[in-house]
Amino acid sequence: DTYKSEIAHRFKDLGEQYFKGLVLIAFSQHLQQCPYEEHVKLVREVTEFAKTCVADESAENCDKSIHTLFGDKLCAIPSLREHYGDLADCCEKEEPERNECFLQHKNDNPDIPKLKPDPVALCADFQEDEQKFWGKYLYEIARRHPYFYAPELLYYAIIYKDVFSECCQAADKAACLLPKIEHLREKVLTSAAKQRLKCASIQKFGERAFKAWSLARLSQRFPKADFTEISKIVTDLAKVHKECCHGDLLECADDRADLAKYICENQDTISTKLKECCDKPLLEKSHCIAEAKRDELPADLNPLEHDFVEDKEVCKNYKEAKHVFLGTFLYEYSRRHPDYSVSLLLRIAKIYEATLEDCCAKEDPPACYATVFDKFQPLVDEPKNLIKQNCELFEKLGEYGFQNALIVRYTKKVPQVSTPTLVEVARKLGLVGSRCCKRPEEERLSCAEDYLSLVLNRLCVLHEKTPVSEKVTKCCTESLVNRRPCFSALTPDETYKPKEFVEGTFTFHADLCTLPEDEKQIKKQTALVELLKHKPHATEEQLRTVLGNFAAFVQKCCAAPDHEACFAVEGPKFVIEIRGILA
């Protein structure tokens, strides 16, 4: 459909509340350092303008694209160059280059302090102005996560508001709020990581890579739906995510609503698990569909070999309709394997494709591809064995110990990577233990590999900004589906020149005593990385001794009457001790 005014069309489709929320998210994701009030002003101006266009679509500037209108708004900010430096250079470009330029300036690791929830203050803010409270949440999440899936953020903001509606009435606000906020925080961080991977796959590997990923995932989740149905949803979903990743948040939210409507209208042919979802309001409905439980497999599934090995038309299909045929294979294989990770399914499809590419050029293709399914077993065994070993290690060491083992492993593999990045990534990799190792056997593989894909994508995104390791670049860029096996296969870097010992790195202060447990761990793990960068060949025994001595030193000073004085005296002794152990 063509509309005289795109902004009027979106305003009418989305309604004022969602329109304002999405505009606020869009500005917050681009201008991540601007104060909230600045954004509110921009949102108000854009909303007023949209209303004039709704009243008269022929009014001045109403025919302009949303990119043009948003870009003009951003470029009109007087302090743009002062606060954002070369982002202001984008304003010299014309659309669509200007929008592309804005997207390239999104910062995945903005220097914004961590949010610390204060229940009393937050309840006061909530009771004073609910609308502002909702907007502030959107702003704070969007500026920290510039690729967050905008319509999904609107959903989380509703949940956030509900938590406060309930807990601010409670006698003990903190007891009610803190666990709920922490639970929501984990969900939001996972959602941010999932969307970042989707955007990376579209932007770095193309739409086809994203479609293959979605085809496998949806085929697992909706095994009763036929290929045509899944393909239609995949195509629509790719459009939605392309738009959101490209900053077209209004169009993205509008199209996502249309897709949810289509899925619910056709749920009989898609999945038996959508009934509850489809009775919910829009945002909850879309979220619920995205998180829907896997449907049961149809009882009458035929052996895959019939269609993809034994049939004499395999090469005809492969040659004449390559993408469709491989898509059918991926669909059929995925729906039969809800226990496999998406990456594993895509690796299997790649092997199948490579085999046909080779065999269909030969004299006797059926004889050549007859054993293709046997080639899949090693692909399945590799992650299964890796997960088994790592889960055993997790059971033995516990979460913190397992994280430390991963810090050692990854610092040795890629010591050039910055210390904060190594700590962040290894800590997140370590969480795979508590997330997945307790799960039933048939869920472990998909849980672990799909989660590791999210964490390794974070490493790739951070590394791309300041590339320091050829090995990381290679693993990140060669193949999306082989990233995890690529990192797993890396060996300690023997070419690395150890860092000089800097005493300041191992200087600690009294603030360490009052830090929450996780921040205390981060301090210790930072020291561990620095230690390894100085002594990459340190043995496990040496590292264990240093960590034990460190814990004793911190415990001693935090129990002393004057913390700071103790750190000043004991700190230098501890450094000498470290050097002695590692000598």
Epitope: T228, N317, V324
Partner: nanobody, 126 residues
Framework: EVQLLESGGGLVQPGGSLRLSCAAS????????VAWFRQAPGKGREFVAG????????YYADSVKGRFTISRDNSKNTLYLQMNSLRPEDTAVYYC???????????????????WGQGTLVTVSS
């Protein structure tokens, strides 16, 4: 989910022609892999010709290549089989089968087609 109804069979002399039709309802025929099979007395169902769903790729058994042509008319939701240069060994009941949601004929195994018409008899005899 898919109902199929064949027509167009009959008695024809060797060397003659016939056009079979298969009208589909309950599903658009262009989204469904559809195929013609035949069954001679005392024999199993054998694949004759097929056409992909949404992808116009056609498939033929070696015994009918160059003589039979499969096609469909999406506006009429109907599948056709144009049979020329008919031979006595083409005598059989002709069935159309559908595998919904399949873009390609990835199998010629009759058991894999969940939907069938009731068949139309073709007799080639002088």
């Amino acid at each position: 989910e898919v109902q199929l109804l064949e027509s167009g069979g009959g008695l024809v002399q060797p060397g003659g022609s016939l056009r079979l039709s298969c009208a589909a309802s309950g599903r658009y025929i262009d989204e469904t892999a559809v195929a013609w099979f035949r069954q001679a007395p005392g024999k199993g169902r054998e694949f004759v010709a097929g056409i992909g769903g949404g992808v116009d790729i056609t498939y033929y058994a070696d015994s009918v290549k160059g003589r039979f042509t499969i096609s469909r008319d999406n506006s009429k939701n109907t599948l056709y089989l144009q049979m020329n240069s008919l031979r006595p060994e083409d005598t059989a009941v002709y069935y159309c089968g559908a595998r919904p949601g399949r873009p390609l004929i990835t199998s010629k195994v009759a058991d894999l087609y969940p939907y069938w018409g009731q068949g139309t008899l073709v007799t080639v005899s002088s």
